[in-house]
Interface confidence: medium
Amino acid sequence: MACLGFQRHKAQLNLATRTWPCTLLFFLLFIPVFCKAMHVAQPAVVLASSRGIASFVCEYASPGKATEVRVTVLRQADSQVTEVCAATYMMGNELTFLDDSICTGTSSGNQVNLTIQGLRAMDTGLYICKVELMYPPPYYLGIGNGTQIYVIDPEPCPDSDFLLWILAAVSSGLFFYSFLLTAVSLSKMLKKRSPLTTGVYVKMPPTEPECEKQFQPYFIPIN
């Protein structure tokens, strides 16, 4: 009974206090004295994707019935343990994390598939899965050995806005260059033709070899 009351109170405290220094030892050593221990398995190592997403399975060996299960992800770096995210779910239903949580997850029987998003190299660390069978009694607590998540930041890319400006500048430059080239070629060609020639629409051959590759102008002679 004391165990149950204590643990429920503790579970509520966990929400309020999101960072506890040196409390992992307390979890591992002190709690099992008061409550029934439960085995929790999770992979030893996971490499986050280039987009900063890491997924792993947290499996617990339920020794009794559970209608309401609470899953908490803790991050241990040095001697500091921080709560990353937590969700309580009804057995057979989906996990629901807070809207602003970096975690998502699905449940299937005694397995919880957890996904942590938005990870960066500085988030590399040991991510511990903590499972609590909240209801019905008896209360069970299980803490995994942790999953070492390695996060490698991708090679820094130029700022997308900067790339856009470069692209715009190059495009503009090419446009003005081609415009200028056309204008110069036209003016040279107009200077060389006779202004009083009469005739019909005639496709003119290039007057100068160097202009050959640039255009094939149409000359419209007028009476």
Epitope: M1, S62, P63, K65, M90, M91, Y135, P136, P137, P138
Partner: antibody, heavy 122, light 108 residues
Framework: QVQLVESGGGVVQPGRSLRLSCAAS????????MHWVRQAPGKGLEWVSV????????YYADSVKGRFTISRDSSKNTLYLQMNSLRAEDTAVYYC???????????????WGQGTTVTVSS | EIVMTQSPATLSLSPGERATLSCRAS???????LSWYQQKPGQAPRLLIY???TRATGIPARFSGSGSGTDFTLTISSLQPEDFAVYYC?????????FGQGTKLEIK
């Protein structure tokens, strides 16, 4: 010996209220979750509601949600079911049953009362 | 909700015969959340089996339960006259908790 005794049933008009009681004896009432289960005439069993050993968790069947309220008074070793806005389809024998033992969490509804009849009719 | 479907609806057998009652869940139910109950006319239900296969206190050895996932079975190895009753399976894996519609075991 371990015993559950329901009371409070009777004939009531639709829309009215009724409160059922279940007196527990022979065991530590505060160590067990408690259920209400009903059985309409000639029909099967239908789970109605459950309350945890300490009263902190309460769950209901969709058919009674918002109308029925389960509660308990450990000082009196008594379980209650407050039934409001009663309908004809609530007519049934109502049983209280003891839930899983808090030490193992593995038993089913192992102790049942004899039931109390609720008839909703105009 | 999880729908529990029992079959057959009625089973007619003679004393001494073996009875096999089936219970199928519409979704997977972990075996520890499955119970069987016996109910005789005018009486309250009685717990026979919990955790799919464990006999409740005072239940004779002729009653046995088995199954996992979605299919569960209650077997009565040799029927006694007092075994003729209605049998219900029940899950408390997922809320709302649900019972099967019952199998009536009658004397042939």
């Amino acid at each position: 010996q371990v015993q559950l005794v329901e009371s409070g049933g009777g004939v009531v008009q639709p829309g009215r209220s009724l409160r059922l009681s279940c007196a527990a004896s022979g065991f530590t009432f505060s160590n067990y979750g408690m259920h209400w289960v009903r059985q309409a005439p000639g029909k099967g069993l239908e789970w109605v509601s459950v309350i945890s050993y300490d009263g902190s968790h309460k769950y209901y069947a969709d058919s009674v949600k918002g109308r029925f309220t389960i509660s308990r008074d450990s000082s009196k070793n008594t379980l209650y079911l407050q039934m409001n806005s009663l309908r004809a389809e609530d007519t049934a024998v109502y049983y209280c049953a003891r839930d899983d033992d808090i030490l193992t969490g593995l038993y089913g509804m192992d102790v049942w009362g004899q039931g109390t009849t609720v008839t909703v009719s105009s | 909700e999880i729908v529990m479907t029992q079959s057959p609806a009625t089973l007619s057998l003679s004393p001494g015969e073996r009875a096999t009652l089936s219970c199928r869940a519409s979704q997977t139910v972990s075996s520890i959340y499955l119970s069987w109950y016996q109910q005789k006319p005018g009486q309250a239900p009685r717990l026979l089996i919990y955790g799919s296969s464990t006999r409740a206190t005072g239940i004779p050895a002729r009653f046995s339960g088995s199954g996992s996932g979605t299919d569960f079975t209650l077997t009565i190895s040799s029927l006694q006259p007092e075994d003729f009753a209605v049998y219900y399976c029940q899950q408390d894996y997922k809320l709302p908790y649900t019972f099967g519609q019952g199998t009536k075991l009658e004397i042939k």
